[in-house]
């Protein structure tokens, strides 16, 4: 149809920096590159209706729906969403095309639905339909990658059964120890599913999607390395694939490798060998032991032997269900104000855990480090010497674990006072929890040495602020002390702090703080 305008519908994804509700706008904010939504004429519809490709948006994401109209003359427009009309302000771009935009900021469930744009031009009227839905992240999964041998090739395929489909990458390192940290120059990343170079020192495969990143390391016994003090242990769940690589380097090719499970040679089809020359013409041999789907009877000691190296073993344990083993008893610590200190949890878990440290309803990232003995450790040092309750939470597909810590900071009491017509109260958060004394200041006792024992009520730790204990002491008013200055003092092993209060004075109570070490 010659009369129909040329229209283009685009989606613009924004970096979030606003929290307004959806609004029609002629000048959207700075954004990512636009994505063409097609906008095809809808067949068998009354009138001219264009339909844009369906738009899926993450919760809290900000987007702009935009229509570019290449038609002569002016245009007027109207947005309709859930039977409500929304203001529409077209403008013209440098190519003199009409531009109509709908900005949706911080996408929520209520903003999902059909957006109808009615456009009236000098020549014709037409409607554009956008369907916006929230991406269902509940269906998203990120599974730890696993290995398979490539059919008829000496290569490993890395597989992660995740939704949306993850990006798979191999992370390779030929160095030893610390230099194989993720961002080290010794680390090489290959964004592909198949790996042919299987001789490296450290081989990991990682899968990442919107939910994060999960990695699996190729379990390796290196016969040229000094064995760990404790036997390396590999856990697997029934049905998972087993891959162990045995690696050995020798001055020449006159050596061979063999795998045994509990002193019996592995069956053919459960291992394969590769060899290549390394630096100084030394020979590297690697021997893989693999089981495509493990059963309980695959548990045991796998030993790699060489005719030119001492044998080394690994204990493979097949479990029905994942686990997290750690002591969950709560732990209390008291430290000085400037003492360096980290909380730490030592655990053994399979599959690998996801974890968080929480303090004062705020979560902190959790790092885990593998130890030589098969255990892992997570440390938290970022407490900034704030006393209170810290929580370590860990979970994997099959298990959950929570451990509580209390941190007390040894310090001299700090006293706060308040008074009413009938009583005066003092509060302190020092640690160890302070003891209290009340003193009356009078002509007979200008230095406030006359102790008050009547009408004093001490409450220790009556208020728990994120695990931080507060101690208070209250003095009930009596005729004997009305109109006098009184002094409350909190003291512990680190010092004393006092506050002076004028009882029964009109208006706001003057408090005089008095620090005594």
């Amino acid at each position: 149809n010659q009369d129909l305008p040329v229209i283009k519908c685009v989606l613009i994804n924004h970096k979030n920096n606003d929290s307004s509700v959806g609004k029609s706008s002629s000048y959207p904010m700075v954004s990512e590159s636009p994505e063409d939504l097609g906008c095809a004429l809808r067949p068998q519809s009354s009138g001219t209706v264009y339909e844009a490709a369906a738009v899926e948006v993450d919760v809290s994401a900000s987007i702009t729906l935009q229509v570019l109209v290449d038609a002569p003359g002016n245009i007027s427009c109207l947005w309709v969403f859930k039977h409500s009309s929304l203001n529409c302000q077209p403008h013209f771009d440098l190519q003199n095309r009409g531009v109509v935009s709908m900005v949706i900021l911080k996408m929520t469930e209520t903003q999902a639905g059909e957006y109808l744009l009615f456009i009236q031009s000098e020549a014709t009227n037409y409607t554009i339909l956008f369907t916006v839905s929230i991406r269902n992240t509940l269906l998203y999964t990120l599974r730890r990658p696993y290995f398979r041998k490539m059919e008829n090739q000496d290569a490993l395929v890395c597989i992660s059964e995740s939704v949306p489909e993850p990006i798979v990458e191999w992370v390779l390192c030929d160095s030893q120890g610390e230099s194989c940290k993720e961002e080290s120059p010794a680390v090489v990343k290959k964004e592909e599913k198949v790996l042919h170079e299987l001789f490296g020192t450290d081989i990991r495969c990682c899968a990442r999607n919107e939910l994060g990143r999960e990695c699996t390391r190729l379990f390796t016994i290196d016969l040229n390395q000094t064995p760990q003090t404790t036997l390396p242990q590999l856990f697997l769940k029934v049905g998972e694939p087993l891959w162990i690589r045995c690696k050995a380097v020798h001055v020449n090719h006159g050596f061979g490798l063999t795998w045994e499970l509990e002193n019996k040679a592995l069956e053919e089809g459960n291992y394969f060998e590769m060899s290549t020359y390394s630096t100084n013409r030394t020979m590297i041999r690697i021997l893989f032991a693999f089981v495509s789907s493990v059963a309980r009877n695959d548990t045991g000691y796998y030993t790699c032997s060489s005719s030119k190296h001492p044998s080394q073993s690994a204990l493979v344990t097949i479990v029905e269900k994942g686990f997290i083993n750690a002591t969950n008893s709560s732990e209390d610590y008291e430290i000085d104000q400037y003492e360096e200190f980290c909380f730490s949890v030592r655990f053994k878990a399979y599959p690998q855990i996801r974890c968080t440290w929480t303090f004062s309803r705020k979560s902190f990232p959790c790092e885990q480090k593998g130890l030589d003995n098969g255990y892992s450790i997570s440390k938290f040092c970022n407490h900034k010497h704030q006393p209170g309750e810290y929580i370590f939470h860990a979970e994997n597909d099959d298990a959950q674990f929570t451990k509580m810590f209390t941190l007390n900071i040894r310090r001299k009491p700090q006293v706060l006072a308040e008074a009413s017509a009938s009583q005066a109260s003092c509060f302190s958060d020092g640690y160890p929890l302070p003891s209290w004394t009340w003193k009356k200041c009078s002509d007979k006792s200008p230095n406030c040495t006359e102790e008050i024992t009547e009408g004093v009520w001490n409450r220790k730790a009556n208020r728990k602020v994120f695990g931080q204990w507060v101690s208070s002491s209250t003095l009930n008013m009596s005729e004997a002390i009305k109109g006098f200055l009184v002094k409350c003092c909190a003291y512990n092993s680190l010092g004393t702090s006092c506050e002076t209060i004028l009882l029964n004075s009109p208006g706001p109570f003057p408090f005089i703080q008095d620090n005594i070490s």
């Epitope: 008829n152 394969f272 020979m283």
Partner: antibody, heavy 119, light 113 residues
């Protein structure tokens, strides 16, 4: 001592297949790769492919892809090379040769098997 | 594929004289990671399989007489027989094993003058 012993000479008709064997002895069969190389009468050496006897994995030269199949039997320490759809230009001596790595020199060679393709 | 080109195609040298065969690869066969040239030389006598003489471009295989030597790096290589003996009459092949497919030179026929 280390040796590779190949099967005897074969005469085949065009379109037929031939399967040549190479039996290894004197070393650990699965610890070395095996290559197949052919040599037409009065011509040079032509690499056909490689097999890892440990895994059975193979890589073939593009020219022979789809016509050649290399297999192994670890119980008898033997590798096999089967060439199908034979034509007269496949008349050659076929050698198996051992190497330490996939990319290494060929240190031990079989004695060769003469395959004649003739109608 | 890496193309290997030998020169000359044939060579006649007097007994006791030096024989030199050249081999050129279409791309470098020097592997930077281990600084090795992935090049070998083979000797083939009539009715026999080839025999490995030199690997890593310059390392003599055990049992090979020391009159055979290899040199060169990258793309240009040489096999030298310092003093030709009657039993050295054969066809000599260079081979790259830097990458698959493995490729051979066309061969150089060495005869006695």
């Amino acid at each position: 001592q280390v040796q590779l012993v190949q099967s005897g000479a074969e005469v085949k008709k065009p379109g037929a297949s031939v399967k040549v064997s190479c039996k290894a002895s004197g070393y650990t069969f699965t610890s070395y790769y095996m290559h197949w190389v052919r040599q037409a009468p009065g011509q040079g050496l032509e690499w056909m492919g490689i097999i890892n006897p440990s895994s059975g994995s193979t890589t073939y030269a593009q020219k022979f892809q789809g016509r050649v199949t290399m297999t192994r039997d670890t119980s008898t320490s033997t590798v096999y090379m089967e060439l199908s759809s034979l034509r007269s230009e496949d008349t050659a001596v076929y050698y198996c040769a051992r190497s330490v790595g996939a990319t290494s020199a060929f240190d031990i060679w079989g004695q060769g098997t003469m395959v004649t393709v003739s109608s | 594929d890496i193309v290997m080109t030998q020169s000359p195609d044939s060579l006649a040298v007097s007994l006791g004289e030096r024989a030199t065969i050249n081999c050129k690869s279409s791309q470098s066969v020097l592997y930077s990671s281990n600084n090795e040239n992935y090049l070998a030389w083979y000797q083939q006598k009539p009715g026999q399989p080839p025999k490995l003489l030199i690997y890593w471009a310059s390392t003599r295989e055990s049992g090979v007489p020391d009159r055979f030597s290899g040199s060169g790096s990258g793309t240009d290589f040489t096999l030298t027989i310092s003093s030709l003996q009657a039993e050295d009459v054969a066809v000599y092949y260079c081979q790259q094993y830097y990458s698959l497919p493995v490729t051979f030179g066309q061969g150089t026929k060495l005869e006695i003058k």
